[in-house]
């Protein structure tokens, strides 16, 4: 029996009956075995077929076999009800080999010419399966020349049998307090040859509860307990299962915070699997009762491990734990069933006793000593000598625990000294030097420190003076002995003040004229204002209208008198302002250098002389009455003049204060 070509030779060719195209002889048997490479099959078709027809092809026939299976037994020329002729059919081997057998019996009624066939190897498409047959691959089948391979969808891995896709379903850990898990593909059939492990791992103190929901369908056996596919549930205490079949298992209260669920499947079956909804419980904490004037959020029927609540107080109440305040409060339920923090109180906000107001007082409006939420107090300043700056003095205890003004300020109001009050009134006439009476010049300051000088009180902690009067002490401010509230220069009864700092105008040059002869002394403490100690006002923008030529100003001091000695009692003199050009001209004659009188100066005195300030008065104020406000203001600072005080044709020269308002305001606001 001749063999067909063997792989790896080219696998194609022609077969024919003996003697073809002539008639075949009797008693012939010829066998061909064709072999294709693995993964290939053989295709065979006939171009000529003429064999003796017999019942079931018992006499002459061509038999096609592949392995043990007979593909066809052929005879005749055309098919009948019981016999088959190939016609235009193509025949395929089942595997990679095909056996062809030709046989003729001992006789033929007439001559038959036999057959001619052609064959070739072709790739088997293993991915094509007949209806009703199991698919070649579980998921994806990929054909190629000489073979095929299977692959799997994401989340699956190819089993070692190279066809089945096993689910990658292990290592999932559920840490939420509730959730759902199910067999792979649920509710579609679960995969074969899979071993799934799911873990529920909650914090210690929780207990997992498992509920099987919807449907349960796991391959089972009528006699043996879950021999094929099964579901098992394991805790640190016990094992539940195995489960299979179609009945939903009962709820499982595991009493454990960790659960392992194992699901194993074999290579067969078509079942939808299972779905579990899990919840958890824990020892509940005591129900939180909101403190008075507070509320709990969120409100729950019960609070278990990890549950929390917050306390919110009504407006005007604050969270307190004991004596310690809290901005917010949240308590968390612990595994032992206790809250991690004690319940706070919502205490009414208490702003506490209001701060004392310097030079003022406070009155309880709501009730004596009432300092709680919405309580009202009223600050006021000591009448006559102080006035309240900016606000009305009414403060309310607000929810933030601070006394707050109607403008929303939390700082105290300020009692500012009233300036420019004097016991003296002026009739406008020029008088000779006179003794001052108590309260006439309450702004008058006596400055001792090397020489005798003067100054004027501004606000309650500044003294305005001449730069030349304090120049020597500019770096040793504490050396200045500052006295106020007295008329008698040598009296032991005075209010003592000390300097904290001396600010000399940066434009002043000592011993080189008196331009910018102005200085400020900051006191180290505020002085108490009364009828004998009152600050002088600074000039308003409109003040120039009260300082025109011939307007009367008043200078005061303890300087030299006509007798050539320092005055024992405070003296004053009313003197008119002198025309600036006239004054400039008076000081352009020798021994005075040109330009001695500048635009930063003003002059006052009589052309005839006799009324003047003198040495020892330096730094004192030349004051004017503002008839609109009825307050005295400082227009000049005693600066310089002729060597002989009160000399005819010469005038006292004063620093023009209105030119220095920005400088004064900047120093005072900065320091």
């Amino acid at each position: 029996t001749p063999l067909g070509p063997k792989w790896p030779e080219p696998v194609f060719g022609r077969l024919a009956s003996p003697g073809f195209p002539g008639e075949y002889a009797n008693d012939q048997e010829r066998r061909w075995t064709l072999t294709a490479p693995p993964g290939y099959r053989l295709r065979l078709y006939f171009t000529h077929f003429d064999l003796e027809l017999s019942h079931l092809c018992e006499y002459d026939f061509v038999k096609l076999s592949s392995g043990a299976k007979v593909l066809a037994t052929l005879c005749g020329q055309e098919s009948t009800d019981t016999e088959r002729a190939p016609g235009k059919d193509t025949f395929y081997s089942l595997g990679s080999s095909l056996d062809i057998t030709f046989r003729s019996d001992y006789s033929n009624e007439k001559p038959f010419t036999g057959f001619e066939a052609f064959y070739a190897a072709e790739d088997i498409d293993e991915c094509q399966v007949a209806p009703g047959e199991a698919p070649t691959c579980d998921h994806h089948c990929h054909n190629h020349l000489g073979g095929f391979y299977c692959s799997c969808r994401a989340g699956y891995v190819l089993h070692r049998n190279k066809r089945t896709c096993s689910a990658l379903c292990s290592g999932q850990v559920f840490t939420q307090r509730s959730g759902e898990l199910s067999s792979p593909e649920y509710p579609r059939p679960y995969p074969k040859l899979s071993s799934c492990t799911y873990s529920i791992s909650l914090e210690e103190g929780f207990s997992v509860i498992l509920d099987f929901v919807e449907s349960f369908d796991v391959e089972t056996h009528p006699e043996t307990l879950c021999p094929y596919d099964f579901l098992k549930i394991q805790t640190d205490r016990e094992e539940h299962g195995p489960f299979c079949g179609k009945t939903l298992p009962h709820r499982i209260e595991t009493k454990s915070n960790t659960v392992t669920i194992t699901f194993v499947t074999d290579e067969s079956g078509d079942h939808t699997g299972w779905k579990i909804h899990y919840t958890s419980t824990a020892q509940p904490c005591p129900y939180p009762m909101a403190p008075p004037n507070g509320h709990v959020s969120p409100v729950q029927a019960k609070y278990i491990l990890k549950d929390s609540f917050s306390i919110f107080c009504e407006t005007g109440y604050e969270l307190l734990q004991g004596h310690l305040p809290l901005k917010s409060f949240t308590a968390v339920c612990q595994k032992d069933g206790s809250w991690d923090r004690p319940m706070p109180a919502c205490s009414i906000v208490d702003c506490g006793p209001p701060d004392d107001l310097p030079s003022g007082r406070v009155e309880y409006i709501t009730g004596p000593g009432v300092t709680t939420y919405k309580a009202v107090i009223q600050y006021s300043c000591e009448e006559t000598f102080y006035t309240m700056k900016v606000n009305d003095g009414k403060y309310v205890c607000e929810a933030d625990g601070f006394w707050t003004s109607s403008k929303g300020e939390k700082s105290l109001p300020v009692c500012e000294p009233v300036c420019g009050l004097s016991a003296r009134t002026t009739g406008g006439r020029i008088y000779g030097g006179q003794k001052a009476k108590p309260g006439d010049f309450p702004w008058q300051v006596l400055i001792l420190g090397g020489t005798t000088a003067a100054g004027a009180l501004l606000y309650d902690n500044w003294v305005l003076t001449a730069a030349h009067a304090v120049y020597e002490q500019k770096h040793d401010a504490s050396a200045l002995d500052i006295r106020m509230g007295t008329l008698k220069r040598l009296s032991p009864h005075y209010t003592q003040a000390w300097s904290e700092a001396v600010f000399i105008h940066e434009g002043y040059t000592h011993d080189a004229g008196f331009d910018n002869d102005i200085a400020l002394i900051k006191l180290n403490n505020k002085v108490v204002i009364n009828s004998n100690i009152t600050p002088i006002c600074l000039p308003r923008k409109e003040a120039e209208s009260f300082m025109r030529t011939d307007d009367i100003g008043t200078a005061s001091g303890w300087g030299l008198t006509q007798r050539g000695f320092l005055a024992r009692n405070l003296m004053y003199v009313d003197i008119p302002i002198v025309d600036h050009q006239k004054c400039t001209a008076a000081y352009e004659k020798p021994p005075y250098p040109r330009g001695s009188v500048t635009a930063n100066m003003l002059c006052a005195g009589l052309e005839s002389g006799g009324k003047d300030s003198c040495r020892g008065d330096s730094g004192g104020a030349l004051v004017f009455l503002d008839s609109e406000t009825e307050r005295w203001f400082v227009g000049g600072i005693v600066s310089w003049g002729s060597m002989n005080c009160g000399e005819a044709g010469q005038y006292g020269v004063y620093t023009k204060v209105i030119n220095y308002i920005p400088w004064i305001e900047n120093i005072i606001s900065d320091f």
């Epitope: 734990q321 310690l324 901005k327």
Partner: antibody, heavy 118, light 108 residues
Framework: DVQLQESGPGLVRPSQSLSLTCTVT?????????WNWIRQFPGNKLEWMGY???????SYNPSLKSRLSVTRDTSKNQFFLQLNSVNAADTATYYC???????????WGQGTTLTVSS | QIVLTQSPAIMSASLGERVTMTCTAS???????LLWYQQKPGSSPKLWIY???KLASGVPVRFSGSGSGTSYSLTISSMEAEDAATYYC?????????FGAGTKLELK
Amino acid sequence: DVQLQESGPGLVRPSQSLSLTCTVTGYSITSDYAWNWIRQFPGNKLEWMGYISYSGRTSYNPSLKSRLSVTRDTSKNQFFLQLNSVNAADTATYYCAIISTAVDFDYWGQGTTLTVSS
Amino acid sequence: QIVLTQSPAIMSASLGERVTMTCTASSSVSSSYLLWYQQKPGSSPKLWIYSSSKLASGVPVRFSGSGSGTSYSLTISSMEAEDAATYYCLQYNRSPLTFGAGTKLELK
């Protein structure tokens, strides 16, 4: 991590004022809680001095109220102690601290030692 | 003010011994607002027990706290060398906050 750090002069003359600073890192002093000053005398006795709360309100030990002021600078996350008219009895280690009103929210500085001596 | 009295002022215990120290208040204190601190030389006090009975984190379970009203105690079930320290109670129930004078625990 929350940290508190005290800083101060170490030596102060009698009758002068003591100023200490507590610098807080890892938590804003306006977020919550009371920010306390506590001192420990040489014999180890502890005394609470006072606090400034998250809102800026203060509470003082009545025994120190007339001499004590606690303030803060929220921009620098610092709070301060000022004790006036100190004397030898104020010699101690001074701590700034948050006292636990919440689980484990209790932090102390390492302390700064103050000696009052002429 | 509430005065806290700790007793004994000094005590010593052998390894493995049970130790109890007390803190007595001059007037009633809510157990929620009583703390215990441990302090070792050269260190600041460390919160040891809060709400009179809850252990701060890192505190060994051999420690326990109990009490109510005016009487509180701290107990060590089995003394270990590292427990040698001074223990202070603190109340923040009412102002001013007050500390006990401390109990110094030494290893015998």
